[in-house]
């Protein structure tokens, strides 16, 4: 299981994964931008066995995922964090 | 080492009923989804049912979810499939597998089968 | 449900040859697919995760790719003890369905 935690530079994830996560098994997807203190854009994942993950942005599955939440978002404003609860 | 052990096979009369069970040891059992995928004989494989840790989840192949019932125990560390009203097309052999939630989401670990055999 | 069509269903390859199998998805599977390898009398063994990803202890000489609707695993140099049936498997939604199976032989 890949930590996730707060530092004093903002950054929460240590390691990240690009392996495929079911959409059964997740409770929510956050997307935080590069800013706020953290150089780089991170997407941290949280399960329904209660564990976290933080996924590679350049994974292939995120990608194709977040391009459908992009299409399906399109009308409405982009926020700068914000978090996606998965049906 | 992680084993899944599986038992309750044999031949049963169709329109009969039997309980499979899937014994685990060497794993975290309260902790995996587990699935029941079965294989006719010469024939590939075909998942049957799914339910996570606290059994508030459970999903079945469309065709077999009415006779079909998956369970589980986790202070046993034990899978079960209730099947019912079989049929001669039911025969095969049933694997129960982890079905990892952590790291891989495939089914990572499989026991060696038990075989049903539905006939009169 | 979704559909896995594999081909080919059999293929006889000689030691040393790059064997290839396909894997079509009916729809958009992401990157939700696995391979199996099953041996006669024995249960299957994960062999690929995520598409591309070596379960651990599997040797390299096994790979996978593909993303959406389109897979494929090769071998890269067959050895005798690859001889087995070889499934891919969906896990992208349920109901789990799996291919036909493709079995290899040596020629």
């Known amino acids: 299981v890949l930590e996730v935690y707060y530092t004093h530079l903002r950054c929460r994830c240590v390691q990240e994964s690009s392996v495929f996560i079911p959409r059964r098994f997740i409770d929510r997807i956050q997307i935080s931008p590069r800013g706020n203190g953290c150089p780089r854009k991170e997407i941290i994942v949280w399960k329904k066995n209660k564990s976290v993950v933080c996924v590679d942005p350049q994974a292939e599955w995120i990608q194709r995922i977040m391009e459908m939440l992009r299409k399906k978002s399109s009308s409405t404003p982009p926020v700068p964090v914000f978090k996606r609860k998965i049906p | 080492e992680v084993q899944l052990v599986e038992s309750g096979g044999g031949l049963v009369q169709p329109g009969g009923s039997l309980r499979l069970s899937c014994a685990a040891s060497g794993i975290d059992f309260s902790r995996y989804w587990m699935s029941w995928v079965r294989q006719a004989p010469g024939k590939g494989l075909e998942w049957v049912a799914e339910i996570n840790p606290e059994s508030s989840t459970i999903n079945y192949a469309p065709s077999l979810k009415d006779r079909f019932t998956i369970s589980r125990d986790n202070a046993k560390n034990s899978l079960y499939l209730q099947m019912n009203s079989l049929r001669a097309e039911d025969t095969a052999v049933y694997y129960c597998?982890?079905?990892?939630?952590?790291?891989?989401?495939?089914?990572?670990?499989w026991g060696q089968g038990t075989t049903v055999t539905v006939s009169s | 449900d979704i559909q896995m069509t594999q081909s080919p269903s059999s293929l006889s390859a000689s030691v040393g040859d790059r064997v290839t199998i396909t894997c079509k998805a009916s729809?958009?599977?992401?990157?939700?697919v696995a391979w199996y390898q099953q041996k006669p009398g024995k249960a299957p063994k994960l062999l690929i995760y995520?598409?591309?990803y070596r379960y651990t202890g599997v040797p390299s000489r096994f790979s996978g790719s593909g993303s959406g609707t389109d897979f494929t695993f090769t071998i890269s140099s067959l050895q005798p003890e690859d001889i087995a049936t070889y499934y891919c498997q969906q896990y992208y939604s349920t109901p789990l369905t799996f291919g036909g199976g493709t079995k290899l032989e040596i020629k």
């Open positions: 995520s598409a591309s």
């Open positions: 597998a982890r079905q990892d939630d952590y790291e891989y989401y495939a089914m990572d670990y």
């Open positions: 729809q958009d599977v992401n990157t939700g």
